[in-house]
């Protein structure tokens, strides 16, 4: 007894073409580029039936259905623009995303077609969803500022300073949106005991009740770093469980490009804000801030050589500023934050420094502020970052 | 950001009817050719398919299972709901539900733990 | 239900090829789908549409099907590759897993 005529879905056709099917003869069915079969909504990778005794197919006749690459996934600080025509997901359809503007950048062009395997794929060939990327560096402030010898900042000033509460208070500098960069005396004992580490951003006034909390996922503390026995390599960095919202309060600042270098010569400003000691003793209620010009490294060691600071001593992983008068300086309580530069080129803010050590006198004559120089740990930072 | 997360007891005596509710993120429920699957696995053992729904409300059990189950969905409120009649102590298991997306299951919940115990 | 059947374990040492097989009735016919599970954590799609890799998943996994058998290759295995790996295919309209597979990496 034959099997009736199959016939062809729609957008496909039928492979072999007989007169007659008989007994266990057989045909597939193959659909056309940008269409799959599907039977139900599962998809098929290849077709065929077999006519059997009773005269009937084995299976039904599967659909050529159009590829849908359904509805794109949100894309994390962004959204997605439909150009093809409004929800239109279907094969060669396009579609754009784009990042919040002002905070957020993309690093490709965003646009997206449904290809015929059934996945957004970008002109790169990527099937992975494109990534905003914080925009670093952007301050309200503009130089001029005088911790020691500091005066307020504003909001928007300073949106990568966060404050570190522990059993002291220290500081830290947002460098991505997950990623905080500080100094390994101010987190040492916490890679363990990271429960007591309290993350806040978004704040100016120390003491505020709004503000942005993070909690740390993971500590690392550099591996050259000796607690107790000076400061070399006095640089850490903390892995936020969350990654933080961006906006104008709160921003990562840049790490430095090679050519910063060039930015941190000696007598060039840098600025550093913080929370800690002012003139008058006491921690700071509200986020200072001072602009202090780099100090020639060999003037520096040599004051600290005629002045020691027990145990420490200036090494070449270090940058030195202040004035020789004093009277500017970072001081306790400012660890870990950072010291910033203007890339007068990308007119975006770098991270030179990282508050260390100094005095116990801070902002004596000739009591410069030490700190970690940040470009000689850019290999180490971006290990950390891309192997987490 | 695609997200999926079960909820639903963590204890179930035998003979009840167990409830699991999946709450998804990031897709639709209702558009393109997306589903959304119940699997499990008892303890220290392999994975199980029980059911799905497609966004064509397309629905399939595990043919062992199929008196047992139910599998519905709430476009508006983003959630597949499961349940499970005359639990039994070896339906003990974790119970995830994950999308799926041309034929693969590409995004999984962190999973459930449900124990069926007098 | 159709059965998928992988072996057991698997050991390999780091940095040489692992190959997984999953074995069912005219499996090559159908779409094959890989998993990696580690301890503690919900699967992970590794291979879809036999020999697909979706976004995230590193180069040296790979996929092949034909025949009976659909197989997994880990390339230059490392030690977090370390997990239980699951074959899934479609019969129908429902979906059947593997056995399940071991890797483990020798120290």
């Known amino acids: 007894q034959p099997c009736p005529d199959p016939t062809a879905p729609p957008n496909g056709h039928i492979s072999p073409v007989q007169a007659t099917y008989v007994l266990k003869d057989s045909f597939s069915v193959f659909c056309k580029t940008g269409f799959e079969l599907l039977q139900g909504s599962v998809p098929l990778k290849s077709f065929t039936a077999v006519c059997q005794k009773d005269g009937s197919w084995d299976r039904p006749i599967p659909e050529c259905s159009i590829i849908d690459c359904g509805p794109p996934d949100d894309l994390p600080n962004g959204h997605v623009d439909y150009i093809t025509g409004p929800e239109v997901t279907t094969y060669k359809a396009v579609i754009q995303y784009s990042c919040e503007e002002t905070f957020y950048t993309m690093s490709s062009n965003g646009k997206y077609v449904c290809e015929a395997d059934g996945f957004w794929t970008s002109s790169k060939g990527e099937k992975s969803l494109p990534v905003c990327k914080p925009v670093c560096g952007l301050s309200t402030h503009t130089s001029g500022g005088r911790i020691i010898g500091g005066q307020p900042a504003k909001p928007g000033d300073f949106p990568w300073q966060v404050l570190l509460l522990g059993e002291t208070t220290a500081a830290g500098a947002l460098i991505h949106d997950d990623w905080v960069l500080t100094a390994a005396h101010a987190v040492y004992g916490k890679t363990e005991a990271m429960s007591s580490l309290d993350i806040r951003m978004g704040i100016l006034k120390r003491l505020s009740l709004i503000y942005t909390q993070a909690w740390p996922e993971a500590v690392f503390i550099h591996e050259g770093y000796t607690h107790g026995a000076g400061f070399d390599n006095d640089i850490a960095l903390i892995k936020l469980k969350n990654k933080v919202t961006i906006n104008r309060n709160i921003m990562p600042i840049c790490l430095p490009r090679k050519e910063a270098a060039s930015l941190m010569k000696t007598d060039f400003v840098g600025t550093v804000a913080g929370w800690g000691l002012t003139q008058k003793g006491f921690l700071a209620r509200n986020l200072m801030f001072v602009d202090i010009p780099i100090v020639d490294h060999q003037k520096c060691a040599t004051a600290y050589t005629k002045q020691p600071y027990p145990g420490a001593k200036v090494t070449v992983n270090m940058l030195c500023a202040g004035l020789d008068r004093g009277g500017k300086d970072s001081c306790r309580g400012d660890a870990g934050g950072a010291l910033v530069f203007l890339d007068n080129e990308t007119q975006r803010w770098f991270v030179g420094g990282i508050v260390s050590w100094g005095s116990i006198n801070c902002g004596g004559s000739e009591q410069y502020g030490v700190y970690t120089k940040v470009t000689n740990y850019i290999p180490w930072i971006e290990n950390i970052i891309n192997n987490f | 950001q695609v997200t999926l997360k079960e909820s639903g007891p963590v204890l179930v005596k035998p003979t009840e009817t167990l409830t699991l509710t999946c709450t998804v993120s990031?897709?639709?429920?209702?558009?393109?050719?997306?589903?959304v699957s119940w699997i499990r696995q008892p303890p220290g053992k392999a994975l199980e398919w029980l059911a799905h729904?497609?966004?064509?409300?397309?629905?399939s059990y595990r043919t062992s299972l199929k008196s047992r189950l139910t599998i519905s969905k709430d476009t508006s409120k983003n959630q597949v709901v499961l349940t499970m009649t005359n639990m039994d102590p070896v339906d003990t298991a974790t119970y995830y539900c994950?999308?799926?997306?041309?034929?693969?299951?590409?995004?999984w919940g962190q999973g459930t733990l449900v124990t069926v115990s007098s | 239900q159709p059965v998928l059947t992988q072996p057991p374990s698997v050991s390999v040492s780091p940095g040489q090829t692992a190959s997984i097989t999953c074995s069912g009735d005219?499996?090559?016919?159908?779409?094959a789908y890989w998993y990696q599970q580690k301890p503690g954590h919900s699967p992970v799609l590794v291979i879809y549409?036999?020999?697909k890799r979706p976004s995230g998943i590193p180069g040296r996994f790979s996929g092949s099907n034909s025949g009976n058998t659909a197989t997994l290759t880990i390339s230059g295995t490392q030690a977090m590759d370390e997990a239980d790996y699951y074959c899934?295919?479609?019969?129908?309209?429902?979906?059947?897993f593997g056995t399940g597979t071991k890797v483990t990496v020798l120290a």
């Open positions: 549409q036999d020999n």
């Open positions: 899934q295919a479609w019969d129908s309209s429902t979906a059947v």
């Open positions: 990031g897709f639709s429920l209702s558009r393109g050719k997306m589903g």
């Open positions: 005219k499996l090559g016919d159908k779409f």
């Open positions: 729904i497609f966004s064509s409300d397309e629905k």
């Open positions: 994950a999308r799926i997306r041309a034929g693969g299951i590409d995004y």
